[in-house]
């Protein structure tokens, strides 16, 4: 899950609701910064590189952020 | 059911302040981006400013931009715009509006019915 | 700033397809979403990301977007369907909602 921070947060709305994982692109956890006060997670999917914005603290999300690091873990050597 | 109900207003002079609401319900308005978006009698839509789901990004339309504040009070489900030094060509219905929820392209799922603005002396 | 071209008027009979176009630089590299809105009435979302749909909007009405033009689709006209029509996209370079001038749908 890559780590990076454009000079402001990037969130306009955000969603309780995980995503497909087959339908991600890719996934970014933004953390706070002097630009921005919040953690950010970012949901690339594969339709034309929209962007959803998810919410850290939902339940969910977590959950699905686990799933995620999980299959990465299983794929790397 | 989702619902945006704008309110104040009304018929102002040039360089006076008046301030719009918009109360949201049927949905969890803290997790969504608002706008306000205008539309003056006879033309076509006109964005106006947006607002993130905790208020901490704000952009507007160059016109409206040192004049114009978009806020909100999720504590109360209302989003806000106060409007100072209006002119003219401020005259306008405005309509608030939900954001769809994607970052990367801002769109319009829910609008108000809208509130007439008419700046005139 | 993005600029997004409509022509202002387009006539068409019942029961025939109606197309709105919409130019603008390279909009196939964008999201392009149409609304619809009928005289006194707030505007209503019909095609969002190019070519989804809303729940509760016939499938009479389609999109699709490449190189500069974007297209608005109504397929089997009906007098109903008579309304302004905008196109709308987020120009990310400016933080900027764009909207079109919008087009006037007439069933004759």
């Known amino acids: 899950v890559p780590l990076s921070r454009t000079v402001r947060c990037t969130c306009i709305s955000i969603s309780n609701q995980p995503v497909n994982p087959r339908s991600l692109e890719k996934l970014e956890i933004i953390p706070a910064s002097q630009f921005c006060p919040r953690v950010e997670i970012i949901a690339t999917m594969k339709k034309k590189g929209e962007k959803r914005c998810l919410n850290p603290e939902s339940k969910a999300i977590k959950n699905l952020l686990k799933a995620v690091s999980k299959e990465r873990s299983k794929r790397s050597p | 059911q989702v619902q945006l109900v704008e309110s104040g207003g009304g018929v102002v002079q040039p360089g006076r302040s008046l301030r719009l609401s918009c109360a949201a319900s049927?949905?969890?308005?803290?997790?969504?981006?608002m706008h306000w978006v205008r539309q003056a009698p006879g033309k076509g839509l006109e964005w106006v400013a947006v607002i993130s789901y905790d208020g901490s990004i704000k952009y507007y339309a160059d016109s409206v931009k040192g004049r114009f504040t978009i806020s909100r009070d999720n504590s109360r489900n209302t989003l806000y715009l106060q409007m100072n030094s209006l002119r003219p060509e401020d005259t306008a219905v405005y309509y608030c509006?939900?954001?769809?929820?994607?970052?990367?392209?801002?769109?319009?799922?829910?609008w108000g019915q809208g509130t007439m603005v008419t700046v005139s002396s | 700033s993005y600029v997004l071209t409509q022509p202002p008027s387009v006539s068409v009979a019942p029961g025939k397809t109606a197309r709105i176009t919409c130019g603008g630089n390279?909009?196939?590299?964008?999201?392009v979403h149409w609304y619809q809105q009928k005289p006194g009435q707030a505007p209503v979302l019909v095609i969002y990301y190019d070519s989804d749909r809303p729940s509760g909007i016939p499938e009479r009405f389609s999109g699709s977007n490449s190189g500069n033009t974007a297209t608005l689709t109504i397929s089997r006209v009906e007098a109903g369907d008579e309304a302004d029509y905008y196109c709308?996209?987020?120009?990310?370079?400016?933080?900027?909602?764009?909207f079109g001038g919008g087009t006037k749908v007439t069933v004759l």
């Open positions: 509006a939900k954001d769809w929820g994607f970052s990367g392209s801002l769109t319009f799922d829910y």
């Open positions: 049927g949905f969890t308005f803290s997790s969504y981006g």
């Open positions: 709308q996209v987020w120009d990310s370079s400016s933080d900027h909602v764009v």
């Open positions: 390279n909009i196939g590299s964008k999201s």
